[in-house]
């Protein structure tokens, strides 16, 4: 089948007194093969730090999966969310407040 | 855009402080962004040095963990490198540049400074 | 710390030539990888970013592909302007490492 970029959206939800968990979801995405992590001051944030989620079908015949991990509140613009699939990417940060962040992939 | 200028001393004694500045124009240091010191030995061999970020965290090479400071003005927009202790070996072109939290690569680099550390 | 190995470290290759240079990771790098030119006398400037994506303003006869531990970056049609040096860098973690840079001279 044609290639379908994922939509990236990256929310976040308080964890514990200041500190606030970070989710990146990545959905509607053929084929399944996806890179998704988060990134802190621009390298990479070690594997143990982060949880991901299964690579799902969604029921379209495209996939859905998530990467989250914990940070400080206060330190959000030091993390991003990295994208990569089928050759495009995209990097996401996260949203100020209460605020969701909704983008397609871009070049 | 982003401009960034290295100033400071072309000639150190050995065992001396090395301190150079960096000014900014065209974006605050306190909006965004890892700024960072980046030099070249003669033998054109690049060494990333360490970080001020916008909120005045820092981060070293371990290399020179000892020897190094990085530290800032704000209402000036600037930030330093200040190398301690310098010997011949540290003869270079030193940068300033930044990164975006995107990634750690570096769209944009000043013009560099050549130090002499010579008796 | 990850080593950055570039070779060769030095090729003379004439216009309109086809030149590959390539860049070892000590380590698996994840594609967290830059290229940059220099002049002679100048500043480097950022061709390449996430080990495949071209910087703004830089020509398509530039490419660049690889993944794990090995990169490289090819130059089709070699230019009047395509001659100087070319480094490689990692952003895995820190420390940030350069390659020891390819000079691309005139034959």
């Known amino acids: 089948g044609s290639t379908v970029p994922p939509m990236v959206n990256v929310t976040r939800s308080e964890a514990s007194e200041g500190n606030i968990t970070v989710t990146c979801r990545a959905s509607g995405f053929y084929p399944w093969n996806i890179t998704l992590s988060w990134r802190q001051d621009g390298v990479s944030l070690s594997h143990d730090t982060q949880q991901w989620g299964d690579v799902l079908p969604d029921g379209n015949g495209t996939y859905q999966t998530w990467v989250a991990t914990r940070i400080c509140q206060g330190e959000e613009q030091r993390f991003t969310c990295y994208m990569e699939h089928s050759g495009n990417h995209s990097t996401h940060p996260v949203p100020s407040g209460n605020s969701h962040h909704h983008h397609h992939h871009h070049h | 855009d982003v401009q960034l200028q290295e100033s400071g001393p072309g000639l150190v004694k050995p065992s001396q402080s090395l301190s150079l500045t960096c000014t900014v124009t065209?974006?605050?240091?306190?909006?965004?962004?890892?700024w960072n010191w980046i030099r070249q030995f003669p033998r054109n061999k690049l060494e990333w040095m360490g970080y001020?970020?916008?909120?005045?965290?820092?981060n070293y090479n371990p290399s020179l963990k000892s020897r190094i400071s990085i530290t800032r003005d704000t209402s000036k927009n600037q930030f330093f490198l200040q190398l301690i202790s310098v010997t011949t070996e540290d003869t270079a072109t030193y940068y300033c540049?930044?990164?975006?939290?995107?990634?750690?690569?570096?769209?944009?680099w000043g013009q560099g400074t050549l130090v002499t550390v010579s008796a | 710390d990850i080593q950055m190995t570039q070779s060769p470290a030095s090729l003379s290759a004439s216009v309109g030539e086809t030149v590959t240079i390539t860049c070892r990771a000590s380590?698996?790098?994840?594609?967290?990888l830059a290229w940059y030119q220099q002049k002679q006398g100048k500043s480097p400037q950022l061709l390449v970013y996430?080990?495949?994506m071209l910087a703004d303003g830089v020509p398509s006869r530039f490419s660049a592909s690889g993944s794990g531990t090995q990169y490289s970056l090819k130059i089709n049609s070699l230019q009047p302007e395509d001659f100087g040096s070319y480094y490689c860098?990692?952003?895995?973690?820190?420390?940030?490492?350069f390659g020891a840079g390819t000079k691309v001279e005139i034959k």
């Open positions: 540049s930044y990164y975006r939290y995107d990634g750690a690569w570096f769209p944009y």
């Open positions: 065209g974006y605050s240091i306190t909006s965004d962004y890892a």
């Open positions: 001020i970020n916008y909120s005045g965290t820092t």
């Open positions: 380590g698996n790098i994840h594609n967290y």
């Open positions: 996430n080990a495949i």
């Open positions: 860098q990692h952003f895995w973690s820190f420390p940030l490492t």
